[in-house]
Interface confidence: low
């Protein structure tokens, strides 16, 4: 019988154990700092711990706070060792403090909705302001138990840094509780209340007959009229009016964790799912040389696009990369800033039939609201950590 460990499949000093119960016939026990089926992936050191299961170590957005892990595939905790929560209502139930759970269906598969006691009004019946939450607000890591409107969604940590996505929406309407719950609440269906998460839209989704076709023809440079609807993602902006230079139109810079081996597919998935979710045309922008505007993070160019300032105490592990990403990296996951063009031509008061956020700031609030209620992460190929809107500018005058 062939010994599966004979070929020494474990890298970086990992020890091999033959086991019939494993898909590969062996298990590698990896040394500290490495992970993956063959210990080939570096688990980045992140302060006093390592980011497991492909998690990415990111500098804290706040000086004086430790770096943190951005976890993949539903894993959580400071080291990304907490296993993913089951989809839907579990068990265990995602609703805390005796909240009752009901299953919902949506783009990302089974979801859930909690009916909560009045004393714990968060989307998962959390108690904002609970003991232990004071020091965690705004530290860059979303603590679900501290997330709710009372604590500004853990100081913005659970809402893409936006302290109150529902600012301007009458607070006693509590539209944050009704947002994207699958039922239409007309009192929340307004710009300031983020259109009730589009729960009032009909049809709510691209018809199955069109969906595959529209997927296959999404942002391919040709306008597919049957896909040029809000529910089908406006064909990824392929049908947008030609009157403006798209290079200078509105855009969103997204900080997202993705896996480079499948980057193209993930960028496509990101653009399409956000187009369908936000009901606006979105696509990965190209620079003047025709390259995707996708930049590794941390990195100077990425942070410039995010509009943020660097923490001077953070040392880059590599020289800042100023070029758009080549596909040469082979690490399990990495942070990227993705610049997406946005077609808002169908939104706004002139298009009452197409109700969608008509400026990039409103798009940010909508995404922040989705993040706050836990509706965003299940849809995306990797965690979305930050969003920076650009309203669009006039192109510079020709230099003679």
């Amino acid at each position: 019988e062939i010994d599966p460990c004979h070929s020494q499949p474990c890298f970086h000093g990992g020890t091999c154990e033959a086991t019939a119960g494993s898909p590969l016939g062996f298990i590698c026990h990896c040394p500290k700092g490495f992970e993956g089926p063959t210990c080939s992936h570096r688990a980045p050191s992140c302060g006093f711990h390592h980011c497991h299961h492909g998690g990415l170590c990111l500098p804290s957005p706040k000086p004086g706070f430790p770096p943190r892990c951005a976890c993949l595939s539903g894993y959580g905790g400071p080291d990304c060792l907490t296993p993913p929560a089951p989809k839907g209502c579990g068990p265990p139930s995602p609703c805390l403090y005796n909240g009752s759970c009901s299953e919902t269906t949506g783009l990302g598969g089974p979801g859930f909705r909690c009916s909560c006691p009045h004393s714990s009004p968060g989307p998962r019946c959390q108690k904002p302001g609970a003991k232990g939450c004071e020091g965690r607000s705004g530290d860059g890591a979303c603590d679900a138990g501290c997330s709710g409107p009372g604590g500004n969604w853990d100081g913005g940590d659970c809402s893409l840094g936006v302290p109150d996505p529902w600012k301007g929406c009458p607070s006693h309407s509590r539209c944050w509780l009704l947002f994207r719950d699958g039922q239409c609440h007309p009192q929340c269906d307004s710009e300031e209340c983020l259109f009730d998460g589009y729960d009032c839209e009909t049809p709510p989704a691209c018809t199955p007959a069109y969906d595959q076709y529209c997927h296959d023809h999404f942002h391919n440079g040709h306008c597919e009229k049957g896909c040029n609807t809000a529910e089908c993602g406006w064909d990824g902006g392929d049908c947008r009016p030609e009157d403006g230079d798209p290079e200078w139109g509105p855009s969103l810079a997204l900080l997202v964790v993705l896996s480079p081996p499948a980057l193209d597919q993930q960028l496509f998935a990101l653009a399409r799912v956000l187009s369908l979710t936000l009901r606006v045309g979105l696509w990965v922008r190209k620079d003047r040389d025709g390259r995707d505007m996708v930049y590794p993070y941390p990195g100077a160019r990425a942070e410039e696009k995010l509009g943020g300032t660097r923490d001077p105490t953070y040392q880059e592990r590599a020289a800042p990369q100023t070029q758009p990403l080549g596909k040469e990296t082979d690490s399990l996951s990495a942070g990227f800033v993705v610049v997406m063009g946005v077609d808002l031509s169908r939104c706004g008061p002139d298009h009452p039939a197409s109700r969608c956020p008509w400026d990039p700031g409103l798009l940010l609030r909508f995404l922040a609201a989705m993040a706050a209620v836990g509706a965003l992460e299940p849809l995306l190929p990797g965690p979305l950590l930050a969003v920076h809107p650009h309203a669009g500018t006039a192109p510079p005058a020709n230099q003679l």
């Epitope: 301007g168 309407s173 269906d189």
Partner: antibody, heavy 115, light 107 residues
């Protein structure tokens, strides 16, 4: 102080029409959903129609669908209910109210449908 | 449509008594329930919303509880000015519906 003042009620024959108005003051009218609720003499409360803050979404009770139209003019801080093909069972006091937990109500206007 | 069934339809109690009115929803409405008081010839007045939040200016003797399908309005110590009809209402989903009312009188 929040104030809602209805007007436009009165006596109308079956099959006739009326237009009710509700003048709002004391709050940012354009930020709130508004509703019409009615109460037949000696009976309970019934939601007639609701409109969201910008007028883009409306709801009607099955009993009035196709006969009544709710609208609003945010520049005039006014809510309207256009009632057509009126029937005896539409006879009630009509209240305009703010929000889904109706914290504020007008004093009501009586609609009498009789030949 | 979601039915809201109130009980009892009427009750008579003495001043100082604890009074409980219940409302049962025909399906889960979370905590999207309000309670109103309507005195004869007057406009309904909001007492409780989100099942247990007292509206501004409502005396503390009024309290609400419940979630899902079963809701309760309690008057901890009945006062003469509490003589009225009380309605529950769900606003979880359209059409928002009211209970048929509970008439409260003093013995």
């Amino acid at each position: 102080e929040v104030q809602l003042v209805e007007s436009g009620g009165g006596l109308v024959q079956p099959g006739g029409s009326l237009r009710l108005s509700c003048a709002a003051s004391g709050f940012t009218f354009s930020s709130y959903g508004m509703s019409w609720v009615r109460q037949a003499p000696g009976k309970g409360l019934e939601l007639v129609s609701t409109i969201n803050s910008n007028g883009g979404r409306t709801y009607y009770a099955n009993s009035v669908k196709g006969r009544f139209t709710i609208s609003r003019d945010n520049s005039k801080n006014t809510l309207y209910l256009q009632m057509g093909s009126l029937r005896a069972e539409d006879m009630a006091v009509y209240y305009c109210a703010r929000d889904q937990g109706f914290a504020y109500w007008g004093q009501g206007t009586l609609v009498t449908v009789s030949s | 449509d979601i039915q809201m069934t109130q009980s009892p339809s009427s009750l008579s109690a003495s001043v100082g008594d604890r009074v409980t009115i219940t409302c049962k929803a025909s399906q889960d409405v979370g905590t999207a329930v309000a309670w109103y008081q309507q005195k004869p010839g007057k406009v309904p007045k909001l007492l409780i919303y989100w099942a247990s939040t007292r509206h501004t200016g409502v005396p503390s003797r009024f309290s609400g509880s419940g979630s899902g399908t079963d809701f309760t309005l309690t008057i901890s110590s009945l006062q003469p000015e509490d003589v009225a009809t009380y309605f529950c209402q769900q606003y979880s989903s359209y059409p928002w519906t009211f209970g048929q009312g509970t008439k409260v009188e003093i013995k």
